[in-house]
């Protein structure tokens, strides 16, 4: 499966909104900083069958998607730039959904990645569990959406490395 | 390869501006801040302020609030410390170093090689 | 702006000495606390961060702890190129601020 040049134009895309969503300053919110153990090795892209990578990217923009889609998110952010950014998330989870399903039927390999799904999904587990600890504050927002931001580069070098195998 | 490289030393006099730059390259420079550091000879290191260059976001230390200013660019992945009206003593290594910002990564990982300013009539 | 006060402020030591160098805050700064390492004419090297991950490349005779206030960088075998100056810095608020360093010195 060749994701669409579309789509690596929308991971850019959905960064740069992701960048224009910072309402307060960085440096007031230094104390809030948090360790939610990103899980870098599924990242990496060198163990993966193709298949196995992208339905980790999926998954990966499927937590941040459901993330932004939340009332608490809504109230946090500026709402056309959510909105914007919520689309171009929403994109790429057709055009990776479509790669599912093709490269599954192709490699054969529908539960190899459980555990690294499974990592993902407590990764975000973490980040919900931290902003609900700090009561959803700003500061907590802003730590979780430079968290994204590093998380959602992560996954567009790996998309990069997909695109290279091909 | 993650490298910040600075401009090479300076020699002053008294009442002179100055520039001095450090140029990040090996990583995504909007995604780290960049902090500049002073080292009088022979002393302890003291932290002047840091700029975050997706932004140009800067906040100074209380002792240098005034002194000098923080500025960077990011289309070419440079930060700049510059002083508008030397003194003698602003005679200094002066260092850059990149913070993670708000994420989750080890501080000040990478460091310039320093720029020694002499200021002297 | 928060405090940083180091001890000693240099020591004499041997090579394969146990070294410790404390470090205190004026105030809590949780476990935000890295320490440096700067050896003359240098950039300072950064050992440790979050008072007790071991930077990357770092050898594991460097070890830091602490939380609070309390802070101590320890060497469990000193090298002979570990004869540097030790520095600690909070980096929980801004103006983030360093401690005035601590001298190892070959005895």
């Known amino acids: 499966c060749d994701l669409p040049q579309t789509h690596s134009l929308g991971n850019r895309r959905a960064l740069i909104l992701l960048a224009q969503m910072g309402r307060i300053s960085h440096f007031s919110c230094l104390k809030d900083r948090h360790d939610f153990g990103f899980p870098e090795e599924e990242f990496d892209g060198h163990q993966f069958q193709k298949a196995q990578a992208i339905s980790v990217l999926h998954e990966m923009i499927q937590q941040t998607f459901n993330l932004f889609s939340t009332e608490d998110s809504s109230a946090a952010w500026e709402q056309s730039l959510l909105e914007k950014f919520s689309t171009e998330l929403y994109q790429q989870l057709n055009d990776l959904e479509a790669c599912v399903i093709q490269e599954v039927g192709v490699e054969e390999t529908p539960l190899m990645n459980e555990d690294s799904i499974l990592a993902v999904r407590k990764y975000f587990q973490r980040i919900t569990l931290y902003l609900t600890e700090k009561k959803y504050s700003p500061c907590a927002w802003e730590v979780v959406r430079a968290e994204i931001m590093r998380s959602l580069s992560f996954s567009t070098n790996l998309q990069k490395r997909l695109r290279r195998k091909d | 390869e993650v490298q910040l490289v600075q401009s090479g030393a300076e020699v002053k006099k008294p009442g002179e501006s100055l520039k001095i730059s450090c140029k990040g390259s090996?990583?995504?420079?909007?995604?780290?801040?960049i902090g500049w550091v002073r080292q009088m000879p022979g002393k302890g290191l003291e932290w002047m302020g840091i700029?975050?260059?997706?932004?140009?976001?800067?906040r100074y230390s209380p002792s240098f609030q005034g002194q000098v200013t923080i500025s960077a660019d990011k289309s070419i992945s440079t930060a700049y410390l510059q002083w508008s009206s030397l003194k003698a003593s602003d005679t200094a290594m002066y260092y850059c170093?990149?913070?993670?910002?708000?994420?989750?990564?080890?501080?000040?990982?990478?460091w310039g090689q320093g720029t020694l300013v002499t200021v002297s009539s | 702006d928060i405090q940083m006060t180091q001890s000693p402020s240099s020591l004499s030591a041997s090579v394969g000495d146990r070294v410790t160098i404390t470090c205190r805050a004026s105030?809590?700064?949780?476990?935000?606390l890295n320490w440096y390492q700067q050896k003359p004419g240098k950039a300072p090297k950064l050992l440790i961060y979050?008072?007790?991950s071991l930077q990357s490349g770092v050898p594991s005779r460097f070890s830091g702890s602490g939380s609070g206030t309390d802070f101590t960088l320890t060497i469990s075998s000193l090298q002979p190129e570990d004869f540097a100056t030790y520095y600690c810095?909070?980096?929980?608020?801004?103006?983030?601020?360093f401690g005035q360093g601590t001298k190892v010195e070959i005895k």
């Open positions: 979050a008072a007790s």
């Open positions: 700029i975050d260059p997706s932004d140009s976001d800067t």
């Open positions: 105030q809590s700064i949780n476990r935000f």
């Open positions: 090996g990583y995504s420079f909007t995604s780290y801040w």
């Open positions: 170093a990149r913070h993670p910002g708000l994420n989750w990564a080890p501080d000040f990982d990478y």
């Open positions: 810095q909070q980096a929980i608020d801004l103006p983030f601020t």
